[in-house]
């Protein structure tokens, strides 16, 4: 039996991530919500303890008992100026227990106090469980990452958290080291290399310079800003739109917590969109006092709002270079880590600073640290796989691709995570009699209904010869090439008439963040989606059958073959069902299926009798 895999855990300030190296490649493991990163949040309620997404999701309802930022406390003394400063901004209470900070919460009606190691251990337990659910067996061995600037006390406390979580901590490694491992920068065989890791996360900014020589990593310098990250960019957007709302509607929403929270969520989404598009729109219904807030922002405006923050990221870069006694020309590799490094302006500033040097950014920046930790865990467990040295990264379609069919249903031709290039073909037909054309609407996403997915493009295939519904055969082909460019072709098989659309991944496509959000939401809504999909499928099956039976018995070719009594019986029942359908579009699956079976009970014996007698 193959030995149990060791996992790599990126224990982050705001989010954590777990990966495993198996079958020759690293898998970043999604949690039960489908999210590849899990909030480093623990919440305590009157009835239960929540960890991860469940905890973060209820933070607004239970702020005093929802703990995050444990990484800012771990291994520090209560009197540490960092602790004293951060405490002012947290909604939960931090108390002093012999100069050790403890988080005090109300749990199941009692006051409880937890050490930061305990909180972090709860997050690590969650990451361990995520890995076990994926692997299907118990996991004990792990590599855990910490910032390069963590002192021994912080490292030891992190290791203790691992032990509390039931993990055998193989090693504590530096986050920038893990990122460098992820890119295989220790295996270039080109002698000593200087690597600058630029890590801009949700709440922290770290710059590290490593020297790598023959698999040996040496931290030459660290710099950064422990309170700079994506949240600060969100704040700039929020302030901008609060002012815009004031100008447009003469109302100040800044004191309304719910309105600000909804605006912040929309701003986060807009920020992500602006990493892949030059413009983003916000549509918030009834934001404040019944006023709908529909607005937009350009990438240029966003860059202007955050220009000082973006520029400020270069100061720690310069400081790190000074401390490492290196000139920028001596840096061989630049590695991007953290979701905020997807911001084009941040990338451009860094690239320009290094005179146009290429950036290592092919691995999802949210996952690079866990990726490297997983590789290190495999090495420490004695994995001799060549792929530990030579990792293969196959490109995949990040979201399902398909088209809209009757009832607004998303019919996927290319499933999410299909390796590309790929090509899929399916036959579709018309929905009504003598339909002259079909509208092909191409969507990406994981939801059951197209309204919840992203429209990529549409085109019309016209000139279909008049025919009853269900007769024409429209062949639709989805073809993605190695560059992720999608060609969709529709051909009427009777005439050979065709039309196509080409969708490239640069205009109007979802950013990686949005893709992840959609995948995450899809997991959350999966059960509801399945019910909805089955319901619409049952409805469509009933509708198709009713119309087919109606047209079958009305066919002139059946004159004299079917008795008037039987014809009336079928038509009456079809009429009953069609009218019922019109009035009951939101009926349950069971009801649609019952009606179909009732209709089949009437029609099948009559129709089969016709063909037996023929």
């Amino acid at each position: 039996m193959a030995k149990a895999a060791a996992i790599g855990i990126d224990l982050g300030t705001t989010y954590s991530c777990v990966g495993v190296f198996q079958h020759g490649k690293v898998e970043i493991i999604a949690n039960d919500q489908g999210n590849r990163t899990t909030p480093s949040y623990v919440a305590f309620t009157d009835t239960e303890r929540l960890i991860g997404d469940a905890a973060k999701n209820q933070v607004a309802l239970n702020p005093q008992n929802t703990v995050f930022d444990a990484k800012r406390l771990i291994g520090r003394k209560f009197g540490d100026p960092v602790v004293q400063s951060d405490m002012k901004h947290w909604p939960f209470q931090v108390i002093n227990d012999g100069d050790k900070p403890k988080v005090q919460v109300s749990y199941k009606g009692e006051t409880k106090a937890f050490y930061p190691e305990e909180i972090s251990s709860m997050v690590l337990t969650k990451m361990k469980e995520i890995a076990e659910a994926y692997l299907g067996y118990p996991v004990t061995n792990a590599v855990i990452t910490v910032p390069a600037y963590f002192n021994d006390s912080q490292r030891q406390a992190t290791k203790d958290a691992g032990v509390i979580a039931g993990l055998n901590v193989l090693r504590i490694i530096n986050e920038p080291t893990a990122a460098a491992i992820a890119y295989g920068l220790d295996r270039t065989g080109k002698g000593e290399r200087n690597v600058l890791i630029f890590d801009l996360g949700g709440g922290t900014f770290d710059v590290s310079i490593l020297t790598i020589d023959d698999g040996i990593f040496e931290v030459k310098a660290t710099a950064g800003d422990t309170h700079l990250g994506g949240e600060d960019f969100d704040n700039r957007l929020v302030n901008h739109f609060v002012e815009e709302f004031k100008r447009k509607h003469k109302k100040d929403i800044s004191q309304n917590k719910r309105a600000v929270r909804r605006l912040r969520t929309a701003c986060e989404r807009a920020k992500r969109t602006l990493s892949s598009s030059t413009q983003a729109s916000l549509e918030i219904d009834s934001l404040f006092e019944g006023i709908d807030f529909y607005t937009s922002i350009t990438r240029a405006r966003f860059e202007e709002l955050c220009s000082d923050l973006f520029r400020s990221t270069l100061e720690p870069v310069e400081k790190a270079l000074r401390d490492a006694k290196l000139d920028k020309a001596q840096i061989h590799d630049l590695v991007l880590v953290g979701g905020s490094t997807r911001i084009p302006k941040v990338q451009k500033l860094l690239q320009d600073f290094f005179n146009g040097r290429d950036l290592n950014k092919s691995i999802n920046p949210d996952e690079a640290v866990a990726y490297g930790a997983a590789v290190q865990a495999a090495i420490l467990m004695g994995d001799k796989s060549e792929n530990v040295q030579d990792l293969l990264l196959l490109d995949v379609a990040p979201l399902s691709l398909g088209l809209e069919t009757a009832g607004g249903v998303m019919t996927a031709l290319i499933k999410r995570n299909s390796t590309i290039p790929t090509k899929q073909t399916q036959i579709f037909t018309t929905y009504s009699d003598n339909q002259p054309g079909v509208l092909i609407q191409v969507y990406e996403g994981e939801r059951a209904m197209t309204k919840d997915n992203n429209l990529l493009g549409r085109f019309e295939l016209s000139g279909i010869p008049p025919a009853p519904r269900g007769v024409p055969q429209i062949e639709v082909t989805f073809d993605i090439d190695a560059n992720g460019i999608l060609n969709v072709t529709a051909t009427d098989k009777s005439t050979g008439k065709a039309n196509k659309i080409t969708i490239t991944n640069d205009k109007g496509r979802l950013s990686k963040e949005e893709i992840e959000r959609m995948v995450q939401e899809a997991e959350k809504y999966k059960a509801e989606d399945e019910v909805q999909r089955e319901r619409v499928s049952a409805k469509n099956a009933l509708e198709s059958y009713a119309f087919n039976m109606k047209s079958a018995v009305e066919d002139e070719g059946l004159k004299g073959k079917i008795s008037e009594a039987d014809k009336k019986k079928v038509l009456d029942k079809c009429q009953e069902v069609i009218s019922w359908l019109d009035a009951n579009t939101l009926a349950e699956k069971d009801e649609f299926e019952h009606k179909r079976k009732e209709l089949e009970q009437v029609c099948n014996p009559i129709i089969s009798g016709l063909y037996q007698g023929a």
Partner: antibody
Framework: QIQLVQSGPELKKPGETVKISCKAS????????MNWVKQAPGKGLKWMGW????????TYADDFKGRFAFSLETSATTAYLQINNLKNEDTATYFC?????????WGQGTSVTVSS | DIVMSQSPSSLAVSAGEKVTMSCKSS????????????LAWYQQKPGQSPKLLIY???TRESGVPDRFTGSGSGTDFTLTINSVQAEDLAVYYC????????FGGGTKLEIK
């Protein structure tokens, strides 16, 4: 003439299985759905579901999903109701009923008693 | 699911009297295309199987005496027995077939 004749009374223990038959005659069996109705002692009628006699596809009412199974032996023009893992609350008379515009012909009923 | 409510739960009348009983549904049973209400009435005499009296609200099943009349539309329905006979002693059930099937709780008719 049209007739639905059901099997005789059954006395069963909790946890056992019972299978009731409903033999149809006097009409084309596969042209009409067969319904099953439960009547607990002193209680009203409760629709359990039905089976499409042409396709064999069953439909179960919400309260009868799980332990209950409808089946057919078309060649013998017979419908069956099987109840698995019998419980005390399954004690009742079970009727089969043919369906046209409504349940126009009924079997005489089969009494099932579940007692330890 | 559609819920069917019958009232009264029981009533006693003398032979020859006219009797009405009510059946209400939790949603309309009218199909606008066929203009039919999908409601049926059944009679169950003591110790016997139920028997179909009326379907589609007012259509009498063949062989059913014309003293039995069904009426109503939408959600409110009535079964009327014009001149009650001794053999009419039974429990009367309404049943909807608009979507799936549901029986009402029954009205017990006793003869004084």
């Amino acid at each position: 003439q049209i007739q639905l004749v059901q099997s005789g009374p059954e006395l069963k223990k909790p946890g056992e299985t019972v299978k009731i038959s409903c033999k149809a005659s006097g009409y084309t069996f596969t042209n009409y759905g067969m319904n099953w109705v439960k009547q607990a002692p002193g209680k009203g009628l409760k629709w359990m579901g039905w089976i499409n006699t042409y396709t064999g596809e069953p439909t179960y009412a919400d309260d009868f999903k799980g332990r209950f199974a409808f089946s057919l032996e078309t060649s013998a023009t017979t419908a069956y109701l099987q109840i698995n893992n019998l419980k005390n609350e399954d004690t009742a008379t079970y009727f089969c009923a043919r369906y046209d515009h409504a349940m126009d012909y009924w079997g005489q009923g089969t009494s099932v008693t579940v007692s330890s | 699911d559609i819920v069917m409510s019958q009232s009264p739960s029981s009533l006693a009348v003398s032979a020859g009297e006219k009797v009405t009983m009510s059946c209400k549904s939790s949603q309309s049973l009218l199909n606008s295309g066929t203009r039919k209400n999908y409601l049926a009435w059944y009679q169950q005499k003591p110790g016997q199987s139920p028997k179909l009296l009326i379907y589609w609200t007012s259509t009498r099943e063949s062989g059913v005496p014309d003293r039995f009349t069904g009426s109503g539309s939408g959600t409110d329905f009535t079964l009327t027995i014009n001149s009650v006979q001794a053999e009419d002693l039974a429990v009367y059930y309404c049943k909807q077939s608009y979507t799936l099937y549901t029986f009402g709780g029954g009205t017990k008719l006793e003869i004084k």
